[in-house]
Interface confidence: low
């Protein structure tokens, strides 16, 4: 969106000015600007910041907007993720397999076959848990085969995600304890896909991926991450730069415009028919008539 003021020109203030286009911008920023007429060919070659010309307009990457994708957005949507994950670090002892040095080598055929069997067994064990995603073996060691592995869980994001995952981790503990108690070697014979040592089952650690708006904001802002912050309104996080109006960190550029660049937010001051404006926040007005007489 381009706003035109017939009698207003913009002039850069000292050092590195960066400007956010529209002082009343909202989190939703237009990503495209249509161009008609003879100048369009020229515009096509000038799309900035990774923008691409589609024949009519510059299509801008997420962080940018404007006719030439020259403007950095002042607000980034950091709505909650679709899913939240949890990882349980577990150790079980498999007694039905003899340990060999080859099992230490994750690219060996022995390891691959063991991994396939173990994964298949765990898929059966955890089959009733909707949040179960799979297992990931991290290490195999001697004694018969001590399997250090992660059980991966995932659930759709809801405000209750923590309770859902907490419940799932409890069910995982119950099921692995049950199977390692039931599937055991009898007279050195294993009648199941895998057998376990009842006393070799341990849960070391449970990690639930936290929904971290600050981290999401920093990542999505990429090289501008140092200047974007998260502020909350009605418990909803907003990832904003100081160029977004209406927040506690908002930069007041008075009659000027705030613009973001690699080196941070700065005010771009305007010149009207009657005044020049200057200063870090464009708060110093000089009447032209006083200069020109």
């Amino acid at each position: 969106r381009t706003t035109s003021f017939p009698t207003v020109t913009t002039t850069a203030v000292p050092t590195n000015t960066t400007i956010k286009s529209n002082p009343t911008s909202t989190p939703t920023v237009p990503r495209t600007t249509t161009c008609f007429g003879d100048g369009c060919q020229n515009t096509a070659s000038r799309c900035k910041n990774g923008g691409t010309w589609d024949g009519l307009k510059c299509q801008c990457p997420n962080l940018y907007y404007g006719e030439l994708c020259e403007e950095v957005v002042s607000s980034i949507d950091i709505g909650p993720p679709e899913t939240i994950s949890a990882q349980m670090e577990l150790t079980v002892t498999v007694t039905s397999v003899k340990f060999t040095e080859e099992l230490k080598n994750h690219s060996s055929q022995e390891f691959q076959e063991f991994k396939q069997t173990f994964t298949e067994q765990m898929n059966i064990v955890y089959s009733g848990i909707p949040e179960y995603v799979g297992v990931n073996i991290t290490k195999l060691r001697l004694g018969s085969v001590v399997v250090e592995h992660d059980v991966l869980l995932r659930t759709k994001y809801t405000p209750e995600y923590k309770t859902v995952l907490d419940n799932a981790t409890e069910v995982v503990k119950e099921k692995i304890t049950k199977v390692t108690t039931q599937q055991i070697m009898i007279n050195d014979i294993c009648s199941d896909m895998m057998c376990f040592n009842t006393t070799g089952t341990q849960v070391q650690n449970i990690t639930v991926t936290q929904y971290d708006p600050e981290e999401d904001c920093r990542k999505m802002a990429k090289e501008y991450g140092d200047y974007f912050v998260v502020e909350y309104r009605d418990q909803k996080p907003y990832c904003i730069s100081p160029c977004e109006p209406g927040f506690s960190v908002s930069k007041n550029c008075n009659l000027g415009k705030c613009q973001m660049s690699l080196s941070g937010p700065q005010c771009l001051c305007v010149t009207t028919e009657t005044h020049w404006y200057s200063g870090e926040t464009c708060n110093q007005g000089t009447q032209k008539s006083l200069v020109y007489g």
Epitope: P14, T15, K222, E223, D226, L262, S263
Partner: antibody, heavy 120, light 113 residues
Framework: QVQLVQSGAEVKKPGASVKVSCKAS????????MHWVRQAPGQGLEWIGM????????RLNQKFKDRATLTVDKSTSTAYMELSSLRSEDTAVYYC?????????????WGQGTLVTVSA | DIVMTQSPDSLAVSLGERATINCKSS????????????LAWYQQKPGQSPKLLIY???TRESGVPDRFSGSGSGTDFTLTISSLQAEDVAVYYC?????????FGAGTKLELR
Amino acid sequence: QVQLVQSGAEVKKPGASVKVSCKASGYSFTIYWMHWVRQAPGQGLEWIGMSHPSDSESRLNQKFKDRATLTVDKSTSTAYMELSSLRSEDTAVYYCSRPYYGSSAWFADWGQGTLVTVSA
Amino acid sequence: DIVMTQSPDSLAVSLGERATINCKSSQSLLNSSNQKNYLAWYQQKPGQSPKLLIYFASTRESGVPDRFSGSGSGTDFTLTISSLQAEDVAVYYCQQHYSFPLTFGAGTKLELR
């Protein structure tokens, strides 16, 4: 420990293309931009551009806009720089470099360099 | 584009003496919001990749000896090696990390006298 390992030296004829690879390890590949810088024999350093592994967005120095293509393969943590329509003045050592944490603009880690020779 | 001009092109200094390399930018690299200057210095030895020494004009990279220091503000910057060691013989480059495209100085070759 961060490591950027580049592909081997190349000899190309004028007009041809070259694709240099840079395999990253020792850090979270998708958080950092990957930059490319070149250095002609006995000359200074020249920034070509950068790409971001999370979404493959790339940013090029205008000088290389029409000839350089930067890509990434997240599955192998490898970045690529392809330069087309080669000319003799493209003879240089090409470096991939990783920026310092929290910045995309100065370089904490560098690949060992790939010498590209353009000669008829 | 911001043009970076280094001087001198080459410099010969005796062991233990002070070496001073200058770098001038065509526009200010000072960010008035945080009062940081967006300039870095690199060292490149023959046949090696560049090595980061200093960023933000004066912040020494971890592991860099304290005989290396950076100073300056706005458009004029200096890299100083307080007491030259034999291993400091190299080419030194300044680089602005203020705006794209990122640009480097042409380099200063530091030799032993």
